[in-house]
Interface confidence: low
């Protein structure tokens, strides 16, 4: 038994009356006194119960007593109006002891055989209490063997009195310009033996003002001031309270940014507290006027410490800080009622002059030098040599400070050389090479580099040859001496160009055969273009319905003539197209291999011979005119022929260009 | 540490030409807005002119719009002022200064943060 | 042009006394006033900006005050190297302009 050595006797037994279970004697008294451990009360019940009934039990009775209180007095076989008999009921001690009181008179009418009771000792459940009684603990109690102990919610801590529950109430910061704070358990009654500390913190220049709302009610005392619980509210200038009682205090106004809030409660009483809203006031700062053209974000109806504004212009206009651009914009009050930064402006955009334009020039539209916000210039390209590509030349100021487009695009605009330009009229003579005039073949470039060749200019920066022509010098552009704008072969009056890179066709072979006989050559500056250079146009897909048998082409250069020596001018000389057949039947017989002539070549020449180009020519440009645009274009490059220039039944093989133009146009769109 | 070293001054005539560079060193150049002040005994300091951390913009004072011309190298974290059509009241010392990190603040600043030792610039006849 | 006027144009000071220089705008230039320290034979040194804000490596007895179109720079416990001509800036409007300064000097 868990009773230890101060409880040797048991605490469960047995009474009866004296002589039980025969009858008692009369004159009896008998006193029995039960005491159970600390924590633990008597339980009493009886299996047998006869004693003589008498008015409110005064002869013969058991009387059942806990310390100086009186459970039962009990007497006769069954209860009536005014007497009590056990029958079946239990008996509860109040504390750990029980009184037994067993008594007879003088006399008995007729024999009773008394009483026969059982008692034990049994746990307490100090949880246990009666309706309208104070409950044991404040929170939550725990019965065990021998005691009970409270315990209490999250937030609250057991006092020393072991029942009551205080309050974790202190240490609360507040520091948000406003708020709420309140009793514990508010609007439910505040906890007991508590004292809660609330501190209100803001940044200095801040002022804090306080407003009770709701109720009030907190125990007071008619005579003395707030003697039980109380509210106090302090600030680094003054105390405001003690406040109790049910009259909300009046708003208080601290003109301090700091301020403590103290709350005690003694062990009684049953109010609902009390709840405060604070909010906070500051030196406000002038009020912030929208620059011309900007607005202010957020509009407030005033701006006090730690408020901000930003600055927005309105599309088209920039902020400007003095005279320096801003990304953004944003000022912040400051404890001393001023802001933190300068108003900017907001100035409209100016794209600023617009870029030169290469080969083109500008022109303002809007006004003389107007460059600001939804002004418009023109690009337009230098007449006659140049023409503008894809594009309108009408370039619009954008909010972003960019000159753009109408199609969105803030790059300049492209001067595009005109091609296939000559001062030549046609149908000359056929027979007989000639000497070329000024501006008659201004795409003519010469190639000099180990031997003499020709090209011809491609757009401004690009020269169309023959691959055999430049490939020994595939691998070292810079090799390659490259003239144009002249007629005469050794003349000092030239435009130079050097060359930044060859391009030689990937199935071209060298020494075995002349397929794809083609090669581009990109030139390290553009070249500018006037009367004397001028590019040739590539062929059209329909072009070849100006290249059929018989057509007219006419090849130039500065090749051998029928003398022997390369020519001093520039000659030219007007051949027609041969059928492919009988060119390819031409170079069919030997030292010719077969299939020397391809589908990638085409001839030109006289049956009767006398009329050819020759070395020195190689890479020069067979060109034809396309009658709708008047405008010459490339048909063939210079490539091989027979033995003897000029052979009769052999004619002068070109690389077929218009078989390369998906070639020529991925090379020069990738570099 | 931060460094500024101008050079180019001396005596010129009116109306002749003079440039002066600053060499920067010790700090981001290409951070940095750039100007350059003057100080006269008389007139004491004048800011002349300042360039943007990436050169796309100039601003002068009303006084030396065209005529001076500030620009810089960004490679060589040099700034230069050519002066031309000089007058003898562009007499002064010619200070090189950052005007503070393009990026501080969200915003540009307008204060001095660094100085040269200046170089002085004499337009006599 | 935002004029600025400091005064007085010239303070005579012991070292150890503490003192305040004044500048004053023709307009408001809400906090955009700087003040340099420029000593003799020396370029001008950057020591407050935005009116109040102090520099890294400026010492903390120079501090600025002021707002709108009046401001301070008030130098506490005066050393014998604090001895110079002090300048005030602003920044406020787009042509950048300077005060003509105040010298302080050993009395």
């Known amino acids: 038994t868990p009773l230890g050595p101060k409880w040797p006797e048991p605490v469960f037994g047995r009474l009866a009356s004296p002589g039980f279970p025969g009858e008692y004697a009369n004159d009896q008294e008998r006193r029995w006194t039960l005491t159970a451990p600390p924590g633990y009360r008597l339980r009493l019940y009886f299996t047998h119960f006869d004693l003589e009934l008498s008015h409110l039990c005064e002869y013969d009775f058991v009387k059942l007593s806990s310390g100086a209180k009186v459970l039962a007095t009990l007497c006769g076989q069954e209860s009536t109006d005014t007497e009590r008999a056990p029958g079946k009921d239990t008996f509860y001690s109040l504390g750990s002891s029980l009184d037994i009181t067993f008594r007879s008179d003088y006399s008995n009418e007729k024999p009773f055989t008394g009483f026969e009771a059982f008692y034990a000792a049994e746990d307490i459940d100090e949880c246990q209490v009666a309706p309208g009684e104070a409950p044991t603990c404040d929170h939550h109690c725990h019965n065990h063997l021998g005691g009970f102990y409270c315990s209490c919610r999250a937030g609250y801590v057991l006092h020393r009195n072991k029942r009551t529950c205080s309050a974790l109430c202190s240490g609360q910061v507040f520091t948000q310009r406003s708020g709420e704070l309140s009793s514990p358990e508010y609007p439910r009654p505040y906890p007991k033996l508590s004292s809660c500390t609330y501190s209100i913190s803001l940044e200095e220049g801040f002022s804090v003002i306080l407003d009770f709302v709701e109720s009030f009610d907190v125990e007071t005392h008619p005579e003395t001031l707030c003697p039980y619980d109380f509210l106090k509210i302090q600030t680094d200038r003054e105390e405001h309270g003690p406040f109790c009682g049910k009259t909300l205090p009046h708003r208080i106004e601290t003109k301090s940014n700091t301020v403590t809030i103290t709350f005690v409660t003694d062990e009684s009483g049953d109010h609902t507290g009390w709840k405060i809203h604070y909010t906070s006031t500051a030196q406000p700062c002038p009020y912030p006027m929208a620059p011309p053209n900007g607005h202010v974000s957020p509009v407030q109806a005033k701006y006090i410490l730690k408020d901000s504004f930003s600055i927005f212009c309105e599309t088209g206009y920039e902020l400007l800080q003095g005279h320096l651009p801003l990304k953004s914009f944003t000022a912040v009050c400051q404890k001393d009622g001023s802001w933190d930064r300068p108003m900017p402006a907001c100035s409209i955009v100016d794209c600023g002059p617009p870029d030169d334009l290469p080969s083109g020039r500008v022109e303002y539209i809007t006004g003389p030098g107007v460059t600001t916000y939804k002004a418009v210039i023109q690009y337009s390209c230098e007449e006659t040599f140049y023409t503008m590509k894809v594009n309108d030349g009408k370039y619009v100021c954008e909010a972003d400070g960019f000159w753009t487009s109408s199609k969105g695009e803030k790059s300049l605009p492209v001067c595009e050389p005109v091609c296939g330009l000559s001062a030549r009229t046609t149908g000359g003579r056929i027979y007989g090479g000639q000497k070329a005039k000024p501006g008659d073949f201004p795409w003519q470039v010469l190639i000099l580099g180990g031997t003499t060749a020709a090209g011809a200019l491609l757009y401004d920066n690009w020269v169309l040859t023959a691959a055999h022509a430049v490939y020994e010098q595939k691998h070292d552009a810079s090799a390659l001496d490259i003239r144009m704008g002249t007629l005469k072969r050794l003349s000092p009056h030239y435009t130079q160009a050097w060359s930044e890179a060859v391009f030689i066709h990937e199935g071209y072979t060298h020494d075995a055969g002349f397929d794809n006989d083609i090669a581009l050559i990109k030139l390290n500056n553009k070249v500018v273009i006037n009367s004397n250079i001028t590019p040739i146009c590539l062929p059209r897909k329909e072009a070849e319905s100006f290249m059929r048998t018989d057509d007219i082409g006419t090849a130039s250069g500065w090749g051998l003539t029928q003398r022997g020596f390369l020519a001093r001018n520039l000659m030219y000389v007007d051949i027609p197209i041969v059928d492919h057949q009988k060119c390819t039947a031409a170079y069919e017989k030997p030292p010719y291999p077969r299939g020397s002539v391809t589908a990638n070549m085409l001839c030109a020449g006289l049956e009767s011979g006398g009329k050819d180009s020759c070395r020195g020519d190689s890479g020069g440009a067979l060109v034809f005119l396309d009658s709708e645009t008047e405008r010459w274009f490339v048909g063939g490059i210079v490539s091989w022929g027979s033995m003897n220039c000029g052979e009769a039944g052999q004619y002068g093989v070109y690389t077929k260009v218009i078989n390369y133009i998906p070639w020529i146009e991925n090379i020069i769109s990738d570099f | 540490e931060v460094q500024l070293v101008e050079s180019g001054g001396g005596l010129v005539q009116p109306g002749r030409s003079l440039s002066l560079s600053c060499a920067a060193s010790g700090f981001t150049f290409n951070d940095y807005n750039m100007a350059w002040v003057r100080q006269t005994p008389k007139k004491g300091l004048e800011w002349v002119a300042t360039i943007l951390f990436d050169g796309s913009r100039t601003y002068y004072r009303d006084s030396v719009k065209g005529r001076f011309t500030i620009s810089r190298e960004n490679a060589k974290s040099t700034l230069y002022l050519q002066m031309d059509s000089l007058r003898s009241e562009d007499t002064a010392t010619y200070y090189c200064?950052?005007?503070?990190?393009?990026?501080?603040?969200?915003?540009?600043?307008?204060?001095?943060?660094?100085w040269g030792q200046g170089v002085m610039v004499t337009v006599s006849s | 042009n935002i004029v600025l006027t400091q005064s007085p144009a010239t303070l005579s000071v012991t070292p150890g006394e503490s003192v305040s220089l004044s500048c004053r705008a023709s307009q408001s230039v809400s906090t955009s006033i700087h003040w340099y320290q420029q000593r003799s034979n020396e370029s001008p040194r950057l020591l407050i900006k935005?009116?109040?804000r102090s520099i890294s490596g400026i010492p903390s007895r120079f501090s600025g005050s002021g707002s709108g179109t009046d401001f301070t720079l008030s130098i506490n416990r005066v050393e014998s190297e604090d001895f110079s001509i002090y300048y005030c800036q602003q920044s406020y409007s787009s042509l950048y302009t300077f005060g003509a300064g105040t010298k302080l000097e050993l009395r």
């Open positions: 935005y009116a109040s």
């Open positions: 200064s950052t005007e503070s990190p393009y990026y501080s603040e969200g915003y540009y600043q307008g204060y001095f943060d660094y």
